[in-house]
């Protein structure tokens, strides 16, 4: 078994009594249907629970829903269904919770056929009160809040109209018809695609991309022949149809669509797709699908403009458009991402990068673990992580990998140890250093969550039988205690804790089944008495992230700087607390060739840090189209990696000259753009 799992760890004294005093049961007065849960605001303790129950009758479906509210992190719930006039709420729209701590909630109601429009219930006081509002349209999508102003909402109607409200859903205005997709950008800007002829589907590849910066008073067409668009970090991407054939290419803008540049990425055909895997203000990870139904493609990483791309990873597993990929941002350590590749023999292997896609490697085999049947050499193998793809294939994997920004270095995931992902029952593994080293944490599949910024890890065994036991660890998964939270086992459906991993409360959701009825039930456990005291300075120890060789002066340098963190000692049983702030001390590193990516017209041969000219461009002037002007590039082949902060050391020369010649970035030329006002 995993270390400490069956062992009396002796770290936490009298925990049964402490937890028993802090375990709160709530039985919901509902027939079992579906249940959805939303947190309203941050550190408010407010939870909304919507239960729905469908009875399919011969002619129609009769539905009933109930709304419950807690303001103490789920310890107690109050039935507030009367606040929404006992109306049936449409679960497919969920509960639209406002950004930040706005306290706003929108619920979309089911209305009878033939009505003029839909109906919503709005709250701006953390669901203490609701206002009923009848809509002049039937919503097709959930209401979308502007990230900058939670009073501004947008929605698409079933008639493909784009509707906007400026007063939190009180009054609505249709600002455009024939809209396929709409998204909020920055500064309350709305981007949307429109069709001219038949429909969104019929006009795919002939759509227009529009922008309004004043909530529909005026518009600008910023792109034509559009297939789709996306926003990532500060980048706006559009996939655009080619003039001559059915291929399309990615164009990118960093000025809200005023000017466009063609991304140096392969074009894709009708059956292929592009996907933004991750993006921040510095760069983007882009997946480009391979031709044919291969189930894989290539990951490219961009420069700081989103234009020049370096090949990052071949044979990247991504099944179909909108399908499954295991690509995971490890949020507990800068620069770390995990994903899966499909190898030549069709087995799936996990890869990890510690430097934002610069290099990928296999995950180190956990110490004291055996290689499984997939391994050719029983002494040499790797850890392979189960993520979205495994879950979609109905393997016995209840959860995707978990990491939290404020639980530095901690990554928890299901996995197997061998040459490839195994279909056998997985175990749970933990890394405390952002994925460099791994340890088996729990035997068999579990649900898991992080509390108190990593001070507590909670797990529940994944079982088809009713359960009544929860496991917890106060030392980053090395030692486990078990607590029986109820005498009567329940059919477990999920673990819920406040997003952000700062809470010390965990809610266990499930249902009880008796001869005639089944009811929803939740148990909320507060761990505050387990972590009796607040952590002090002596409870923390220094940890250098990305350290692989203490003797190397550049040890820990990733993207041009290293970071030392204060980490909680595994032996300290104390509260980080809700106000815990990660303490880190960065220091700048000297530049090396590793801090540069290959510039336009250059590439890196395998296992070489030097960039060499692409043979087909040797001796040619490097001229390319940028923001609608032709540019001449003088370079020795290097461009600093986005977000890299190194100084001194190696300093390759780079100069871009504006040739003062107009050029069109293929299909998105400024000449084709037009504006209009309402």
């Amino acid at each position: 078994s995993a270390p400490g799992e069956d062992e009396e760890c002796g770290r936490v004294r009298d925990f049964v009594a402490k937890l028993a005093n802090n375990t709160h049961q709530h039985v919901f007065d509902d027939l079992r249907g579906s249940v959805s849960l939303s947190w309203v605001g941050d550190s408010t303790g407010v939870i909304l629970v919507l239960t729905t129950f469908h009875v399919p009758l011969v002619i129609m479906t009769f539905g009933q829903s109930k709304l419950y509210r807690s303001e103490d992190y789920g310890k107690n719930f109050k039935d507030i269904t009367d606040l929404i006039n006992n109306t049936f709420i449409r679960t497919e729209f969920g509960m639209a919770i406002g950004p930040e701590n706005s306290g706003k909630v929108v619920l979309t109601a089911e209305v009878s056929g033939g009505s003029r429009g839909g109906r919503i219930f709005r709250s701006s006081d953390f669901a203490k009160n609701f206002v009923q509002t009848d809509l002049p349209f039937h919503p097709l999508t959930q209401m979308m809040y502007s990230p900058q102003n939670s009073d501004y909402l947008l929605a698409l109607s079933t008639e493909n109209g784009l509707w906007v409200s400026k007063n939190f859903g009180g009054k609505w205005e249709e600002i455009h018809k024939a809209v396929c997709l709409a998204k909020w950008g920055s500064d309350n800007t709305i981007f949307f695609t429109t069709y001219a002829n038949g429909s969104c589907k019929a006009d795919l590849g002939a759509l227009e991309l529009w922008r309004t910066s004043d909530l529909g008073k005026s518009f600008k067409t910023i792109g034509v022949k559009i297939y789709s668009f996306g926003l990532g970090g500060r980048f706006l991407f559009a996939s655009v149809m080619a003039d001559k054939d059915t291929t399309r290419r990615i164009h990118v803008s960093t000025d809200q669509g005023d000017t466009w540049s063609m991304a140096q990425l392969p074009s894709v055909g009708q059956e292929q797709f592009y996907s933004i895997l991750a993006a921040n203000d510095d760069m983007v990870f882009m997946h480009v699908d391979e031709p044919g139904d291969t189930g894989f493609g290539t990951i490219f990483t961009s420069d700081d403009r989103g234009i020049v791309y370096s090949k990052s990873l071949d044979r990247h597993l991504y099944t179909t458009t909108g399908g499954e990929t295991d690509f995971t941002n490890v949020t507990s350590l800068r620069g770390v991402y995990i994903t899966s590749v499909l190898s030549e023999d069709n087995s799936i292997q996990t890869m990890i990068t510690f430097d934002q896609g610069g290099r990928w490697t296999h995950l180190r085999k956990p110490e004291n673990s055996e290689c499984d049947a997939t391994a050719k050499n029983k002494n040499e193998c790797s850890l392979h992580i189960h993520a979205s793809y495994s879950i979609s294939q109905k393997l016995n994997v209840p959860m995707a990998p978990l990491s939290e920004p404020n639980a530095v270095g901690i990554v928890i995931a299901h996995g197997s140890v061998g040459d490839a992902i195994s279909v056998m029952v997985p175990d749970v593994y933990i890394s405390d250093d952002g994925g460099y080293s791994w340890t088996k944490m729990l035997e068999g599949p579990h649900y898991y969550t992080i509390l108190d910024s990593g001070g507590i890890i909670v797990a529940i065994e994944h079982s088809s039988r009713p359960i009544n036991v929860i496991k917890f660890s106060t030392d980053e998964g090395q030692c486990w205690q078990t607590y029986t939270f109820t005498r009567d086992p329940i059919y477990f459906t999920g673990l819920a804790s406040e997003p952000g991993a700062r809470s010390m409360n965990i809610s266990i959701w499930g249902f009880t089944e008796s001869f005639l009825t089944s009811q929803w039930v939740s148990y909320t456990i507060d761990f505050k008495d387990i972590l009796e005291r607040n952590c002090e300075e002596k409870d923390y120890t220094i940890w250098l992230a990305h350290s692989t060789d203490p003797e190397d002066y550049e040890d820990g340098c990733i993207l041009g700087y290293k970071e030392q963190f204060l980490r909680l000692r595994k032996s300290s049983v104390c509260q980080n607390g809700r106000d815990y702030v990660v303490t880190k001390q960065p220091s700048i590193c000297l530049c090396s060739l590793e801090d540069f990516l290959c510039d336009f017209g250059y590439y890196r041969p395998e296992n070489d840090s030097k960039c060499v000219e692409q043979p087909e461009l040797k001796g040619h002037d490097l001229e390319f189209c940028l923001y609608g002007r032709e540019e001449h590039l003088t370079t020795n082949g290097y461009r600093k990696i986005p977000g890299d902060k190194c100084q001194g050391g190696v300093n390759p020369v780079r100069e871009v000259k504006d040739l003062k010649k107009k050029c069109t970035s293929n299909f998105l030329s400024p000449e084709k753009q037009n504006s209009k006002s309402n």
Epitope: G4, R11, W543, P550, G556, K570, S571
Partner: antibody
């Protein structure tokens, strides 16, 4: 090669202070904690504390708090341990020892390089 | 402070014998347990760190096991140069503490 060279033996009177030095060579001095451990004649090992040469931060065993001061001089890769208000039961061999590191952790993995030891005799 | 109890305090063995020394912590120290060898007049030498990892340069006849509170150092085949005193040490909680030592003597 990696080594720690300590200062020579000392004879002190009760109530006096002693300062033992430990010069590191063959490795990056600031990359590892320096521990101090003592061993009384015929007895076992007793940990006194550590100094972080990078920051100068220290951690002392409660038993020596207020009597011990651990410092370092990075320019000459040397760590120091000063023990004041000496008593006869402070007679011991004092060792400096480098803390072993593991993937970014400075503590928890033992002490992999030791000095030759400095004998301190406290006698009136 | 965490107490480290080593047993036996001394043992006599012959060359080629399998020797086992145990160390018990007064509370769980997970795997933060290290083993040292010390010969008379010399500084201690790290043999095993993190309960079971062999320090580089140490012969493979030395091995460590255990987790939580109970730990073991095993010498699979005792060699003449192995006659010494062995100490366990916990490095989980400050203050770091050592066991009382086990003296391995020639039978």
């Amino acid at each position: 090669q990696v080594q720690l060279v300590q200062s020579g033996a000392e004879v002190k009177k009760p109530g006096a202070s002693v300062k033992v030095s430990c010069k590191a060579s063959g490795y990056t001095f600031t990359a590892y904690y320096m521990h101090w451990v003592r061993q009384a004649p015929g007895q076992g090992l007793e940990w006194m504390g550590w100094v972080n040469p990078n920051s100068g931060g220290t951690m002392y065993a409660q038993k020596f708090q207020g009597r011990v001061t651990m410092t370092r001089d990075t320019s000459i890769s040397t760590a120091y341990m000063e023990l004041s208000r000496l008593r006869s039961d402070d007679t011991a061999v004092y060792y400096c020892a480098r803390g072993k590191r593991s993937s970014g952790w400075y503590e928890g993995y033992g002490m992999d390089v030791w000095g030759q030891g400095t004998t301190v005799t406290v006698s009136s | 402070d965490i107490q480290m109890t080593q047993s036996p305090s001394s043992l006599s063995a012959s060359v080629g014998d399998r020797v086992t020394i145990t160390c018990r912590a007064s509370q769980s120290i997970s795997s933060y347990l290290n083993w040292y060898q010390q010969k008379p007049g010399k500084a201690p030498k790290l043999l095993i760190y993190a309960a079971s990892s062999l320090q580089s340069g140490v012969p493979s006849r030395f091995s460590g096991s255990g987790s939580g509170t109970d730990f073991t150092l095993t010498i699979s085949s005792l060699q003449p140069e192995d006659f010494a005193t062995y100490y366990c040490q916990q490095s989980d909680v400050s203050p770091i503490t050592f066991g009382g030592g086990t003296k391995v003597e020639i039978k």
